[in-house]
Interface confidence: low
């Protein structure tokens, strides 16, 4: 077992460890999410730039200051373009967000196009029928019972969003839905204990080719691709969507992640590899925008004057383009979209971020050299709650992202999509679904605490994301029943 | 279609405690949740938990916190009660009902199971 006193000998302050566990024995025995865990530790030394923590019993940095993460995300990226997530590349491991650095560039210079401005309003159609079928089902069942538990309910519109615009599936009926669904939840709230083994022994799960993610799912991504791949003849249909894109991968057989695009840094598009990426897109596309809908719906229910605000907004733009919800619409909503961006302040889905020094690098401004192959954390939840950049933090207000107050912020205070060229490919997507749903919500709908809205929600401490515990209920009193 | 049967009710003293037990049959991968409710003489039912087959989130009512315990067994397709500390104010018949995903509208119900609190 390794000794504690790795960042004692470095003169870097922090916590008191702990046998095994080093700093992480709540969120090791899943008392406590680990984004909750890093919020606590970062807490604990106010005055610091860097905290020395143990993960399990690997010494790990917590970077407080936002200049030093400036030079970690952004200045000194190249050092830094590594997640650090070491386990076996087959069975979903060589996917776009815990790919190493050379696969990411290869992989991510490929997906980028498809969230242009272009691509995203062919698929808003898709996600307006999505969004309609889902209005639908929420209309019947308010006839029934006006209290929902939004969180899993926003599930299955964002499961038919990303099933529709990224792989061409229409999920009928609910029941399907729940199938699919069931089977993906499962990777987001199964405890695995691969990722401690990795933190204890880094490298091992790569070593001994274990992955961090059940055998159903990967099943479940393989029979999916396949499914694709033969509807389509194995070539790309012209939908110009993600399963398009990939099978012109497919085709090439393998991309570059050099410049010169010498074989030596090529990555051979297998099947295993195209189900990498379907997997991280659906996880991605589905489970972090309904949870960030279903804490804005929260706050809109504990915040009736917000609410009216933005409903009062809504009915503007809608009656100003003859009721219809289009691309555009959604990007005028000027407080809808900072109401947005304040849910992803108080709520940030992704916890902590995390890069690997690809080489030893001395810390600006400190004293501190961390050495080669050392884990960086940052902790945005940290960031987003302390008051030195939020003033009263726990208080949802959308106004702290007028123009003038974002200006006046440090550019790391905010960092729901981490920051960098290795932020999340994705965050246009899941903004334009996310305001899209609730748009078409609140044209419709008055959300409200129910008897059973829980106002002391915590964090699930199973989910490897941010999520509510135990879900979030309000009711939906549907419009015409409340003017 | 899903069919519930509940089992474990009967007459227990105050201080005692009991397991009830609701098998699932049928369509149950249509089910996302499984909850148990109660409803004493002359009162509406009331929801007491409920648990998510998928990922086990639970949720309790306020009033029965500390004392009543839901618990799933998935291979078995069976949720559990157990209820400790029993009151005279727990004789009630208490239901097992299954939801769909995203709401909460319990559309399967099972008969009730009696439980009787006294001395």
């Known amino acids: 077992m390794r000794t504690f006193n790795y960042w004692k000998k470095r003169n870097v302050r922090g916590p008191e460890p702990v046998v095994f566990f080093g700093n992480l024995k709540d969120s090791a025995l899943r008392k406590k999410n680990m984004g909750v865990v890093m919020e606590e530790l970062y807490n604990m030394f106010p005055e610091e730039k860097v905290i020395g923590i143990y993960r399990m019993t690997s010494p790990c940095l917590l970077v407080r200051d936002l200049d030093v993460i400036k030079h970690i995300m952004i200045k000194d990226f190249e050092v830094f373009s590594d997640r650090g997530v070491e386990f076996s590349k087959e069975g979903l491991g060589s996917n776009l967000f815990h790919a190493d650095g050379e696969t990411w560039r290869a992989l991510g210079n490929r997906f980028t196009p498809i969230f242009t401005s272009g691509k995203l309003k062919n698929m808003f159609y898709l996600m307006h029928e999505g969004a309609d079928n889902f209005i639908d089902h929420v209309s019947a069942e308010c006839e029934k019972n006006q209290e929902f538990e939004v969180h899993s309910l926003l599930q299955t519109y964002t499961m038919s969003t990303i099933a529709a615009c990224a792989f061409g599936i229409s999920y009928d009926s609910i029941g399907d839905k729940v199938k699919a669904l069931d089977i993906v939840d499962k990777i987001i709230s199964e405890p695995s204990y691969a990722i401690e083994l990795d933190m204890m022994y880094p490298g091992l799960l790569s070593k001994l080719n274990l992955s961090i993610f059940p055998t159903v799912v990967k099943n479940f991504f393989k029979s999916l691709v396949d499914n694709i791949v033969a509807q389509r003849n194995g070539k790309p249909s012209g939908r110009n969507d993600f399963m398009d894109l990939i099978l012109e991968l497919r085709q090439l057989g393998e991309v570059t992640s050099n410049k010169y695009g010498s074989s030596a840094s090529s990555l051979e598009i297998t099947d295993e590899v195209i189900c990498a990426q379907a997997f991280v897109f659906y996880i991605a596309g589905y489970e972090t925008s309904a949870t960030t809908m279903a804490y804005m719906i929260y706050q809109l229910a504990l915040n009736p004057d917000i609410q009216n605000k933005l409903i009062a907004e809504v009915d503007e733009v809608l009656k100003a383009n003859d009721g219809k919800v289009t691309y555009d619409t959604v990007k005028e909503m000027k407080y809808l979209n900072k109401a947005f961006d304040e849910t992803l302040r108080m709520y940030s889905i992704v916890e902590p971020l995390q890069r690997k020094a690809t080489r030893d690098y001395k810390i600006p401004g400190t004293d501190v050299v961390i050495e080669k192959d050392t884990i960086v954390l940052i902790s945005p939840r940290g960031i987003h709650y302390d008051p030195k950049y939020y003033d009263n933090p726990k208080q949802f207000n959308p106004d702290r992202f007028d123009a003038e107050e974002v200006g006046k912020r440090h550019p790391c205070a905010y960092l729901p999509f981490g920051l960098g060229q290795r932020n999340c490919i994705g965050m246009r997507f899941g903004r334009l679904q996310s305001l899209l749903c609730i748009t078409k919500i609140l044209s419709k709908f008055r959300i409200e605490p129910s008897k059973n809205t829980d106002r002391n929600l915590q964090v699930e401490p199973h989910r490897g994301l941010i999520g509510p515990k135990g879900g979030i209920r309000v009711n939906a009193i549907p419009r015409k029943l409340v003017s | 279609q899903v069919q519930l049967q509940e089992s474990g009710g009967g007459l227990v003293q105050p201080g005692g405690s009991l397991r009830l037990s609701c098998a699932a049959s049928g369509r149950t991968s249509r089910s996302y949740a499984m909850g148990w409710f109660r409803q004493a003489p002359g009162k509406e039912r009331e929801h007491v938990a409920d648990?998510?087959?998928?990922?086990?989130?639970?949720y309790y009512s306020d009033s029965v916190k500390d004392r009543f315990t839901i618990s799933r067994d998935n291979a078995k397709n069976t949720v559990y009660l157990e209820i400790d500390s029993l009151k005279p104010g727990d004789t009630a018949v208490y239901y097992c009902?299954?939801?769909?995903?995203?709401?909460?509208?319990?559309?399967?119900w099972g008969q009730g199971t009696q439980v009787t609190v006294s001395s």
């Open positions: 648990i998510a087959w998928s990922d086990g989130r639970i």
């Open positions: 009902a299954s939801r769909a995903r995203g709401t909460v509208s319990y559309n399967y």
